[in-house]
Interface confidence: low
């Protein structure tokens, strides 16, 4: 049956899917608060632009009886059930915000004719790449892969004079939703990461990981894992680690590293942490005071989804264009809009661009310091600390293969970013 969109005559509605299975275990009340805060901002912006229209959100809850595991692994059908609810009510907003789980987003995209835009806080997996009406407001796996390949190839920085072509990936199946899909992308045999690396092995057992740390016959010195410092400590403990081991800890949605009083524990000295550049004003926001750092990013993505809709609505209304058209559905990409915490850029495929930050532990201060940053929009690495106080020999990152001779480094007088 044809679902009518409540999206004309000065009244514009946002359908927000409130799913029991979510990328992050966030109370739905917090997401409602984020959406409502976003609505207030959008109304103000439209009013300032002289557009006298009504913007509201309809929250659509799943019944929670069938799909109540709380995590994403059982979410495939939940999104479709919610779409059926919309279909039964024959009422749909101008835009769909949610779902956040890769499985449900992928299934919803397959099973519906999406003539309206879908905005997701999550949907991290490669299966949600290149979807014409899907916008993702949290860094998807593709962006991580591009950073890693770029960083592996870099060989002309004062602290990284070797190209790397090998890696171990630790993935034991208990990861959070974001980590699950990030590691999945690295594991996939047909992914860009796998294509660019000469050697890659996935470690699935704790013991495998622990053995590699001191194994003289290891095939790579580099281990990628995903999670926070506590997760690493549970696995590694205070075990001895060979001096040329480098652990890359992917912990994108955690800005605790940037807090003033944080001291890096000793077990983090062989670790480079990949995280996102921290926001500025979120800590004081009414909806985020009680949120953990990860959940703050999740709630922010919901809020920014509302602001993105407001941005597009304003443009189309000012140009006198119809909102219920394929043009509107396909417009949520290749743009920059004013997010809650500053400008937000979406790439050609509607995926959020961001500044990734690689941190190291200073052996002098025991503080996390920024080694380099990476702008996903232009696929470039920018060095920040040209003389890092590393634990590694000569304050340089080691070669990825023990015993391999030096490879061509950078030029003598100039240091360049990649």
């Amino acid at each position: 049956s044809q679902v009518s969109q409540n999206c004309h005559n000065g009244s514009y509605e946002i359908s927000v899917l409130m799913m029991g299975n979510s990328a992050f275990a966030e109370p739905l009340k917090n997401l409602e608060d984020a959406v409502n805060e976003g609505l207030e901002i959008v109304r103000g912006r439209l009013q300032n632009a002289g557009l006298n229209v009504t913007v509201n959100a309809t929250f659509m809850y799943s019944d929670g009886l069938i799909h109540n595991s709380g995590d994403c692994r059982s979410s495939t059908c939940e999104g479709l059930d919610l779409l059926r609810k919309i279909s039964n009510a024959q009422r749909m907003g101008c835009v769909l915000i949610g779902p956040s789980c890769t499985y449900s987003t992928f299934q919803m995209y397959l099973d519906t004719e999406l003539s309206y835009p879908m905005i997701s806080a999550g949907s991290f997996g490669l299966s949600c790449d290149y979807k014409e009406t899907l916008t993702r407001l949290m860094s998807p796996a593709r962006k991580l892969m591009y950073f890693l390949v770029n960083f592996w190839k870099t060989n002309d920085l004062p602290f990284k004079t070797y190209s790397w072509s090998t890696s171990y990936v630790y993935k034991n199946g208990t990861e959070t939703e974001d980590c699950f899909w990030y590691l999945n992308a690295l594991e996939a045999s047909v992914s860009y990461f796998s294509h660019e690396l000469g050697f890659k092995v996935v470690l699935r057992q704790d013991k495998e990981f622990q053995d590699i740390l001191m194994d003289h016959n290891r095939k790579s010195n580099v281990i990628i894992m995903c999670g926070g410092p506590e997760f690493l400590y549970k696995l590694k403990g205070d075990r001895a680690v060979a001096e040329d081991i480098v652990i890359i800890l992917v912990d994108l949605f955690n800005d605790q590293y940037f807090e003033d009083n944080v001291t890096a524990p000793d077990y983090m000295k062989n670790v480079l942490v990949l995280t996102l550049s921290p926001g500025n004003s979120l800590l004081n926001s009414s909806f985020s005071r009680n949120l953990s750092p990860t959940k703050r990013d999740f709630a922010l993505a919901y809020l920014n989804g509302i602001l993105l809709f407001g941005h597009m609505l304003k443009i189309f209304l000012e140009n006198g264009e119809n909102i219920t058209t394929p043009k509107f559905a396909h417009a949520f990409r290749n743009l920059t809009f004013e997010g809650y915490d500053g400008p937000v850029t979406l790439d050609d495929w509607g995926d959020v661009d961001s500044t990734m930050v690689l941190l190291y532990t200073s052996v002098d201060t025991k503080k996390y310091k920024v080694l380099l940053t990476y702008d996903t929009h232009v696929n470039k690495t920018y060095p920040v600390d040209m003389s890092p106080t590393f634990t590694w020999k000569n304050s340089k990152l080691p070669n990825d293969i023990t015993g391999r001779g030096p490879q061509g480094g950078g030029g003598s007088e100039n240091l360049y970013f990649q």
């Epitope: 061509g408 950078g410 007088e413 360049y416 990649q418």
Partner: antibody, heavy 122, light 110 residues
């Protein structure tokens, strides 16, 4: 002495092609980013794109992606700009430049070539 | 792209004058405590020459009468006491996201 020298400019008909060269000397070419910037008569500077000789990673501005290609020959310490489907509005002086990154982590265009004039006219 | 707007577009001044040119970016060009903004001088028929990098750092060989300031979106180039050789066109440039230049400010003799 650090130097960049462009060549290959001249008169070309609309729809035609031209390949500009930039010969680099006096510095380690392979680890730099080499750029092309143009300036139409009486107008401002417009960035076209860049290439990193060490791994031939290129970034070309959206405006030029379909028609312009940047390449390098590391053996010759040279960068190239291949321009196809030329239009009258491509008439400009084309400069080759490089970015350096200082030890403090800043980057900018510090050395420029003298420029080569491309005129697109029938 | 980040847009850069320079003002004024042209300016007449005399030798010895203090001159200020401003450049406004469409979004912040700050990056980890640095402002990725440069100023270049260009004379007719010549290539641009770097004057200031990172908003306020003087490039090698540039006279100290040139100075730069600003952060975020608003930047200024100041020439404290104009010399005859300073009459030229000045461009600001950002390297925060790709590379864009301002439209230029032509500094002429009054």
């Amino acid at each position: 002495e650090v130097q960049l020298v462009e060549s290959g400019g001249g008169l070309v008909q609309p729809g035609g092609s031209l390949r500009l060269s930039c010969a680099a000397s006096g510095f380690t070419f392979s680890s730099t980013w080499m750029h092309w910037v143009r300036q139409a008569p009486g107008k401002g500077l417009e960035w076209i794109g860049e290439i990193k000789p060490s791994n031939e990673l290129t970034n070309v501005h959206e405006k030029f992606k379909d028609r312009f290609t940047i390449s390098v020959d590391k053996a010759k310490n040279s960068a190239y700009l291949q321009m196809n489907s030329l239009r009258a509005e491509d008439t400009a002086v084309y400069y080759c430049t490089r970015t350096i990154t200082t030890t403090e982590g800043y980057w900018f265009f510090d050395v420029w070539g003298q420029g080569t004039l491309v005129t697109v006219s029938s | 792209d980040i847009q850069l707007t320079q003002s004024p577009s042209s300016l007449s001044a005399s030798v010895g004058d203090r001159v200020t040119i401003t450049c406004r970016a469409s979004e912040s060009v700050d990056y980890y405590g640095s402002s990725l903004m440069q100023w270049y001088q260009q004379k007719p028929g010549k290539a641009p020459k770097l004057l200031i990098y990172a908003a306020s750092k003087l490039a090698s060989g540039v006279p100290s009468r040139f100075s730069g300031s600003g952060s975020g979106t608003d930047f200024t180039l100041t020439i404290s006491s104009l010399q005859p050789e300073d009459f030229a066109t000045y461009y600001c440039q950002q390297t925060r996201k790709a590379y864009t230049f301002g439209q230029g400010t032509k500094l002429e003799i009054k």
